[in-house]
């Protein structure tokens, strides 16, 4: 009996540019002789329904149809036909099929590959055109994929040390697509510093599919109102 097992759950998630290993384990009733077996990996894009051959291994030869694609002959000996794809790109997401032939038997399995890119986040202070005692803080998230992202603002005061979500005076702009397929978005928080307690900690919280835990950027309101020079206006706050 010949059986193929892919990633549990049928989906693998990998970071953009990573060297991804798409799992495919072979279960066979006898020891595997790699010189008399064949492995073929196929890929079907998310946008087109056409299947494309990615890699082929048979007997004493292997061929990569995608640069760098490889199945390890040394791992194949112990039943591991996993496909290594170095420098994975967003457009390589989709369905991957592992087909194993041990004549006359044939088995196959499929897995969905999702490619994600984590956002980078930074805080900026924009005082241009703002009224006295008014500040605009911008939280820029860039280089993320997929497009769905959640940006919120929170504050902690000495009176209320637990974070409180801010819903007023928050404007989140549209997501902008970059040339490489990733996205950027900016969320703005308008503050009237005269109405806020010095020592209040504000946080921009970014949640995205690529992140295990939310990305947090914060600043603390000081007694003296912020007055940043032009160059400081693009600096990150810790």
């Amino acid at each position: 009996d010949l059986k193929v097992e892919m990633m549990a759950g049928g989906t693998q998630i990998t970071p953009l540019n990573d060297n991804v290993t798409i799992f495919c384990n072979i279960f066979y009733s006898q020891p595997l002789n790699i010189t008399s077996m064949g492995i073929t990996w196929f890929w079907k894009s998310l946008t087109f329904d056409k299947e494309v051959k990615v890699f082929e291994f048979f007997g004493d030869h292997q061929e990569a149809f995608r640069p760098g694609a490889i199945v390890s002959p040394w791992r194949l000996k112990s039943g591991d036909a996993s496909l290594r794809l170095p420098g994975i790109q967003l457009e390589e997401a989709g369905e991957y099929r592992c087909e194993v032939v041990v004549t006359p038997l044939k088995a196959q399995g499929t897995v969905q590959l999702e490619v994600v890119a984590s956002p980078a986040s930074r805080l900026l202070l924009d005082q241009v055109g703002m009224k006295e005692n008014e500040d605009k803080y911008m939280c820029e998230s860039s280089g993320f994929y997929p497009e769905a992202i959640n940006i919120t603002w929170e504050k902690q005061t000495q009176k209320f040390p637990h974070p409180i979500e801010i819903s007023e005076d928050v404007i989140t702009g549209p997501t902008i697509k970059n040339m490489d397929g990733t996205f950027n978005v900016t969320s703005c928080l308008k503050l009237n510093s005269s109405q806020e307690d010095p020592g209040t900690v504000y946080q921009c919280v970014v949640r995205h599919a690529s992140l295990h835990t939310p990305l947090r950027s914060n600043f603390t309101l000081t007694a003296a109102r912020h007055s940043l020079s032009e160059t400081e206006k693009t600096d990150n706050f810790s």
Epitope: N19, D60, P73, W74, R75, S78, G79, D80, S82
Partner: antibody
Framework: EVQLVQSGAEVKKPGASVKVSCKAS????????MDWVRQAPGQGLEWIGD????????LYNQKFRGRVTLTVDKSISTAYMELSRLRSDDTAVYYC?????????????WGQGTTVTVSS | DIVLTQTPLSLSVTPGQPASISCKAS??????????MNWYLQKPGQPPQLLIY???TLHSGIPDRFSGSGSGTDFTLKISRVEAEDVGVYYC?????????FGQGTKLEIK
């Protein structure tokens, strides 16, 4: 920085078993196989076998088959080599080594070695 | 099993002079256009360290005075200018077939 840290020296009686551990750090544990190699006093290197941490698949040198068991614990990035029915000629330094398996096959990082002495 | 025979078994070299070690395999270690021959150096009291893999590729961090060549059954490790730190035992290893086997070792000492 890639590091392989092995357990300490062992003294065993003939017929007993020994289990050597190899804790890996500084790389993705499942991306490489773990080789085990031994070296008897004043002798050359002898390949025992290897294990694929991805699926637990093992390949053994026939010479040791039935006496050696290679295992891994992925959760703590640790590989183990257990040798049973020890004989005096099993006295050696036992090494674990990280093995590249996709773009060639070679051991690029080695543990410091574990001395196993079998004596009655 | 593939048997690897190294020659010479020992050599004594003056610093700055070249050195060469041969490794002959009992059968070809080539597969799909690549040669699965590796070279290691074991310095006294240390584990082996990788020098060359796939017959001729220098491992990262290894000085370029080391070079490897050959294919099929005949392989050579060359040191263009031997230095005091090169002392130890040099091993060839084939990784084409299991069991992976090593040569018996070549001991290099400084004159």
């Amino acid at each position: 920085e890639v590091q392989l840290v092995q357990s300490g020296a062992e003294v065993k009686k003939p017929g007993a078993s020994v289990k050597v551990s190899c804790k890996a750090s500084g790389y993705t544990f499942t991306d490489y196989n773990m080789d085990w190699v031994r070296q008897a006093p004043g002798q050359g290197l002898e390949w025992i076998g290897d294990i694929n941490p991805n699926n637990g698949g093992t390949l053994y040198n026939q010479k040791f088959r039935g006496r050696v068991t290679l295992t891994v614990d992925k959760s703590i990035s640790t590989a183990y080599m257990e040798l049973s029915r020890l004989r005096s000629d099993d006295t050696a330094v036992y090494y674990c080594a990280r093995s590249e398996v996709f773009y060639g096959n070679y051991a690029d990082y080695w543990g410091q070695g574990t001395t196993v002495t079998v004596s009655s | 099993d593939i048997v690897l025979t190294q020659t010479p078994l020992s050599l004594s070299v003056t610093p700055g002079q070249p050195a060469s070690i041969s490794c002959k395999a009992s059968q070809s270690v080539d597969y799909d256009g690549d040669s699965y021959m590796n070279w290691y150096l074991q310095k006294p009291g240390q584990p082996p360290q990788l020098l060359i893999y796939a017959a001729s590729t220098l491992h990262s961090g290894i000085p370029d005075r080391f070079s490897g060549s050959g294919s099929g059954t005949d392989f050579t490790l060359k040191i263009s200018r031997v230095e005091a730190e090169d002392v130890g035992v040099y091993y060839c290893q084939q990784s084409k077939e299991d069991p992976r086997t090593f040569g018996q070792g070549t001991k290099l000492e400084i004159k």
